[in-house]
Structures are given as C-alpha cells and as structure tokens.
C-alpha cells in the first residue's frame, strides 16, 4: 500500500501546456506530440546521437514546495538503443542526468547551470531496440528519485542530455505519508512519521509464513521519513525453497513445479524428461536414461547423449578425402553437439591396420568440431582408410557408450613423380622423372607444365609418353617453374612438387651442365 501522494508537478497531465525552458534554445530538447493508444500525448525529446559534446538542458517551471520536505520524482521515459543507429553512433549515450535547484523566487527565463545540483544519472532498465521502435512498442522506463530535506519556497528540476536518444513522457513530483506496508515479504506496521527532518523511525519487519531472511542477509528493517514514505529498506525476506511469492505471501510450489533455493524467482515447471514432483518440491529428478551436466541449470530439461551422425559420406579427390555428415537425428535435447574424427589406414596387401592421425592432415582440428564436414589430405595411394565420426554433447561424458558412424575409402591415385634436372643450356632445360614401376602401367602420358618464375599470366604444357623431355626456346639466365603430372585413365595423378630450374647465362662456359 502506498501512502497519500500529494502531487506538486505532473507533466503528463498538463497536455503540453507547461512550457518548460530549453537551453540552448531550439537545439536540444524539443516538445513533441505523438499518438499512443489513439490518444495525443506530449513528450520532451532529444536525439543528437551523431554529434559529440552534447550539453542540452531542459528546466521545469518553478514548483512551489508547500509543506514538502522530501520530494519524490517519478520519471517515465524511453531510450533508444545506440546500436540501432548505423555504425553504433560512436558518440551516442544511453543515460541522462537529473538535477534540481532550490530558490525562494521564480527566475523565469534566467537559466544558470551553476545553481543546479545533480541528483543522479538516470539509466534505463530497458532500451528500445530497432524492432520495438519499428513496431511502435514504447519501452517505457520508470525511475524514481527523492531529494530532501528542502528548505526554500520552491524548486526547479532540470534534465541534462549528453548525447542520448531519449523522450521524457512523464515527470511527476510528489510527497507522501507512511501506511502499513507489506514489502519484500516482510510486514511493517503503520508508523507515525517523525516531525523533524533528521528523525527517521527504524521499524523492524516480520517475515510472512514460509519466508526467511536469506543466508547472509540482514533482518528486514525500514525507516519512515518525515514525508510519510518508507525509505532505506534494509534486508529482505524471500520465499524458502519449495515456495514462491504469490502477491504478498509464500505459497507451496504446485505438484509438477519446483524451486531449488531461497530466492525471488517463482516456482518453475519441472522441465522435460524429469519425474513429476510433489507439492513444495525443491527439485525434479531426471527420468532414467536422461542426465544433467554439472553446469546445467535445474530449470533445463534433462538430456541424453546424441545419436550417431545421421549420414556420413567420404568422397575421394586424389590424395584428399572430403568427409561430410548430417547432424544426429536425435540431438539428445541439447545444442552443444561437437564431432570428433578419427582415422585408420589399412595396407591392402597385408591387411594390417593402424591409426593414421600423425600421417594425415585435417583442414581443421579433428576434435571438438562444430561444422559437419572436414577435408583430410596427405593420404597415401593404394591404401584403404576408415574414418570414424563421433557425435558428443554435454552429457556424453556421463555414459560409457559412444555414438559414431564410419566410412571407408580407397586411395588409388598415383604417387607424385620424382623430378630431376638432367642438363641445361642458355635456352633449354632437360628434365627427367620417375614413378614406382607398379604404377607405370596405369600412366597414359606425362604432362610437363612450365613457366617463367614471376609470370603468373601464361604457362606452357608439354605431353610425352617417356620419362624425359627437353624444354627448348627458353630465355637465357632465367628461372623456370617446372611441374610433372601423370595422366591416367581415371584422370590426373598427383603432381610433383614445383621445381625451380635456371637456364645458363650467355657467358656460361659449357653448353651442358648438371
């Protein structure tokens, strides 16, 4: 219950007729009219977020104090999210400052900043993001501050903008008295307010049934101020575990609901895959086969490990294999799925198998993968490979079984030719190569690609059935990049590494040198 409120100033009720002072004139705060709920409403607004060094003031008219000694200032306002502007508007702010000044007379339009004392920086609980703005959902913040004791005949309030996008929809100033109070699940009796400014009566509160002072917390106490308002709440009562706050009382959690600690939160419905709880439950047990990871909140459903990756393919591409899979059909109810890839190689002749992690290269680390594909390279020809992809989530460690799928692939591509420079002159290079005899029968031709080093725009290709070639019509004293690749009926074999060979300079003595 609130005390009697005696209103001294109400901007929203004045219908835009108050005519507050803006400084600098015409640059910052602006009185706007808008339509809300089919009703015209007035607001003071400012939105100079793209310019730095803003110092825009809005001052109320002079307010007669009367008998008030401590005043309460209730602000209703909206603040736009700085991130809703392009580039985040680097000079944009999301707060404004509240000031007051006391005086025995109305200064009219004579505004002097130095007379004002800061009450507080006002920050919103909720900022208006782009979607709210577009949908015209005004995220209205309500903040209340108090000032006192006041001693002069009247006062002004002032609002300083330092670069926010803010609209003040309501400014209400009032003073009040102390009723019987039920707050924070503590009951405070009606209290006569002291008559002197320093006189604050300390009143002890009593926790309602099934509410307790939280561990380490203070006993609930409040102070009744001269203006009739309860001030400075100390301590609080919270509903014990298994109970939730309903209006001003603590009520047992209904069957199927739980609350696991002394807190302000309500009872939560037992999450999925838990057993039904009795009335007043403090937790909900997991169904058989379902688990909670240590970091899972009690409010999260119990979950289980995922099934195996749904579909796994291994596509050979020369000496590489691309593994692709789809997520498990059953995620276990979790989103923290990761994948691990392991590799086994088998020699076809002996049938002997062993791990191959050290001899292959993965496109990214093969453990803790979040993507559903990986490329494995540096595979050996004439070798059979088996890849295993395992799916895991946050509760996989709580069971011994694993969820995996395997795929096998044979590597048939020829080995890269081993290339040698047999001889060179000022205008030619003689090159030879070899590949293992068992693979030679599969080779149809060899393709020799060469180009000047540093010239990426053109290259030359020679094809031959033999194991050597002389490259003619070359430039003297020039380095050439040479690569040899076997061509088979299945396509291109692995290319040799790119060699750098240099022709002789015209001054070179011999016509042939190795």
């Amino acid at each position: 219950a609130q005390g009697k409120e005696v209103v001294l100033l109400d901007f929203a009720a004045a219908g835009g007729e108050l005519g507050w002072l803006t400084h600098p004139y015409g640059k910052g705060w602006d009185l706007m009219q808008n339509i809300m709920n089919d009703m015209p409403i007035y607001m003071y607004s400012v939105c100079n977020v793209m310019s730095g060094d803003q110092d825009n003031w809005l001052r109320t008219n002079w307010v007669y104090r009367g008998e008030a000694e401590r005043i309460f200032i209730e602000l209703k306002f909206t603040v736009r999210d700085c991130n809703s502007f392009p580039g985040g508007a680097s000079s944009c702010k999301e707060t404004f400052n509240l000031y007051y000044a006391e005086s025995d007379l109305d200064y009219g339009t004579n505004f002097q900043k130095r007379l004002f004392t800061k009450i507080d920086t006002i920050a919103p609980d909720e900022i208006t993001v782009s979607s709210d703005f577009e949908a015209r959902h005004v995220k209205l913040n309500v903040e209340e501050r108090s000032v006192g004791p006041l001693t002069r005949k009247g006062f002004y309030l002032a609002f300083q903008d330092i670069g926010a996008c803010v609209a003040l929809l309501s400014v209400r100033v009032y003073y009040k008295k102390c009723p019987e109070l039920l707050q924070s699940l503590a009951r405070f009796p009606e209290t006569i307010a002291g008559s002197d400014a320093p006189s604050l009566a300390t009143v002890a509160g009593t926790c309602v049934d099934h509410a307790v002072v939280p561990p380490g917390g203070e006993e609930p106490r409040m102070h009744c101020a001269v203006d009739g308002e309860w001030l400075v709440p100390i301590g609080q009562c919270l509903c014990q575990a298994g109970y939730e706050k309903v209006e001003d009382a603590c009520q047992a959690c209904s069957p199927g609901f739980f609350k696991f600690e002394v807190s302000e939160s309500p009872c939560l419905e037992c999450p999925e895959h838990t057993l039904p709880s009795p009335e007043g439950a403090t937790s909900c047990e997991c169904e058989e086969g379902f688990f909670r990871a240590p970091q899972d909140p009690m409010s999260m459903p119990c979950t289980r490990p995922p099934s195996a990756p749904h579909y796994l393919t291994a596509v050979g591409m020369g000496a590489k294999v691309e593994l692709r899979w789809t997520p498990p059909q059953d995620s276990g109810g979790r989103e923290d799925i990761v994948y691990s890839v392991t590799c086994e190689q088998c020699w076809p002749e002996s049938g002997e198998c062993g791990p191959c992690e050290s001899s292959v290269r993965y496109s990214e680390p093969p453990h803790g993968l979040t993507r559903t594909s990986v490329t494995v390279s540096d595979l050996e020809p004439h070798m059979n490979y088996t890849f295993t992809v395992e799916a895991r989530n946050g509760v996989s460690g709580l069971v011994t079984s694993r969820s995996f799928r395997t795929a096998s692939v044979s590597i048939n591509q020829t080995e890269p030719p081993k290339v040698r420079l047999e001889g060179r002159s000022t205008t030619s290079l003689s090159v030879s190569w070899s590949i293992p005899p068992p693979q030679q029968s599969r080779v149809w031709k060899y393709e020799v690609t060469y180009r000047k080093k540093g010239d990426s725009n053109s290259y030359n290709v020679r094809r031959t059935e033999g194991f050597s070639v002389t490259l003619d019509d070359l430039a003297p004293d020039t380095t050439y990049l040479v690569q040899v690749q076997a061509l088979t009926q299945e396509g291109q074999g692995a290319g040799s590494k790119v060699h750098e060979f240099q022709t002789l300079s015209p001054e070179g003595s011999g016509s042939l040198a190795v």
Epitope: D30, M32, Q33, N34, I35, M43, S45, V46, C47, N48, V49, M50, T78, V79, R80, S84, F85, P86, T128, S130, S131, F133, E134, A135, R136, V138, C165, V166, A167
Partner: antibody, heavy 128, light 107 residues
Framework: EVQLLESGGGLVQPGGSLRLSCAAS????????MAWVRQAPGKGLEWVSR????????HYADSVKGRFTISRDNSKNTLYLQMNSLRAEDTAVYYC?????????????????????WGQGTLVTVSS | DIQMTQSPSSLSASVGDRVTITCRAS??????LAWYQQKPGKAPKLLIY???NLHTGVPSRFSGSGSGTEFSLTISSLQPDDFATYYC?????????FGQGTKVEIK
C-alpha cells in the same frame, strides 16, 4: 549501396490485373518497412500502401483499398503489389520505397513513416 | 485525411539565392514532416525528416523548420544541382499525404 528495382509495369485494360515486383539489394531487407508510392503523369506523389519489416501490419490508401494487395518475401528480398480491378486513374509511375529506423534519429517513432530510399519506378498504363 | 498545401507552386531563382518553400497542414502534425527533392524522370530523394533533421548525406545548405501546421524548407545558397521539384509529406497519420510540389526553376 541500397538498390530498389521495380518491374512488372505495362499496358493493361480497365478491369485488368498486374503484379508489380521490387527487387531489393545492398541492405538487410527484413529490417525495412517497405511501401509503394505512385505519381500520375505530370502530377504529384501519392502514397499507395505500406508493409512492416516482417510482413505486417499493412496499410492502404482509400483510393486502392480492396483492389490492391501489398506483400513481401524476405527470403527473396522482394516486395510485391498485386493490382486488381484497375482503373484509368491508376495510370502512374509506381515507386517502391523503404524506411530503416536506424536512420531515423528520433526517440519515439512517428505515427507513420517517411521514405528514405526509392526505386527508379515502373510505369503502369490503364487504357482500353 | 490531412491535406498538405505547398506554396509557391513554382518559383524562379538564381544560383546563390536563398530560397524558402512553405508547407501548411490542414491540422496539427507536430513535427512529423519530411521534405523530398525530385528531378524530371527520376525518383524522389529524402532531404529532411521530423521537420528539421537533415538526412544522411544531404548538404547542409538545406534546412527545415516549423511545427504544428506551418513548415518551411530553406536552401541557403541555391546550387545548379538544386533546380528540381520539392515535396513535403506528413507522416502524422497512416494516410501519409504529400504536398502538390514546388518547382524551383532557373531565373
């Protein structure tokens, strides 16, 4: 760079139908309110219809209510205007226009919108 | 619907001139008013919104003022690129009506 490209205009007989499209690129289409504005030959601008960023709400000028339907497909970055029961007075260049709240430096949105970005327009001629 | 009336309907001016166009609303629209520039055969371009806010990239020689029912667009020093037709638009109501336009021609 924001680009809006209208298509689908042409000659149609009174009572006929046309469907205009507006292909958007260079911005996040699903963040924008979109609208159609028309301009009869030698005349001023007339707002026709608008649609919210996610497909609603929609508003129409009285002159087209019940005959025109605005829609959008955010997956295709495209705005549409289905025009039925066309009349001679619907003859105009039809512009697709957009509004992004990020460039609207006000604390509370206006009761309606203005138009920050415009397409080049497509001509609709209704004549027998 | 809210009616928007622009004046003059056309004006002749020289490069460097200060030009002011006015727009009157048939009822109060607070400051919910935008100004656009349109050249022949081209789409309109936004200049000003909320009566006085300059749209991104618009030269500072353009300025807007007014609230309630009386508004004006001022070009402080007319440039060759500014010869065009200018429209005001209210967005205080869902009808989003435009003025009839003011054509700025070379004297």
């Amino acid at each position: 760079e924001v680009q809006l490209l209208e298509s689908g205009g042409g000659l149609v007989q009174p009572g006929g139908s046309l469907r205009l499209s507006c292909a958007a690129s260079g911005f996040t289409f699903s963040h924008y309110m979109m609208a159609w504005v028309r301009q009869a030959p030698g005349k001023g601008l007339e707002w026709v219809s608008r649609i919210g960023p996610s497909g609603g709400p929609t508003h129409y000028a009285d002159s087209v209510k019940g005959r025109f339907t605005i829609s959008r497909d955010n997956s295709k970055n495209t705005l549409y205007l289905q025009m039925n029961s066309l009349r001679a007075e619907d003859t105009a260049v039809y512009y697709c226009a957009g509004y992004d709240s990020g460039y609207d430096y006000v604390a509370v949105a206006g009761p309606a919108e203005y138009f920050q970005h415009w397409g080049q327009g497509t001509l609709v001629t209704v004549s027998s | 619907d809210i009616q928007m009336t622009q004046s003059p309907s056309s004006l002749s001016a020289s490069v460097g001139d200060r030009v002011t166009i006015t727009c009157r609303a048939s009822q109060s629209i607070s400051t919910w008013l935008a100004w656009y520039q349109q050249k022949p055969g081209k789409a309109p371009k936004l200049l000003i919104y909320k009566a006085s806010n300059l749209h991104t990239g618009v030269p500072s020689r353009f300025s807007g003022s007014g609230s309630g029912t009386e508004f004006s667009l001022t070009i402080s020093s007319l440039q060759p690129d500014d010869f065009a037709t200018y429209y005001c638009q209210q967005y205080n109501s869902y009808s989003r009506t435009f003025g009839q336009g003011t054509k700025v021609e070379i004297k």
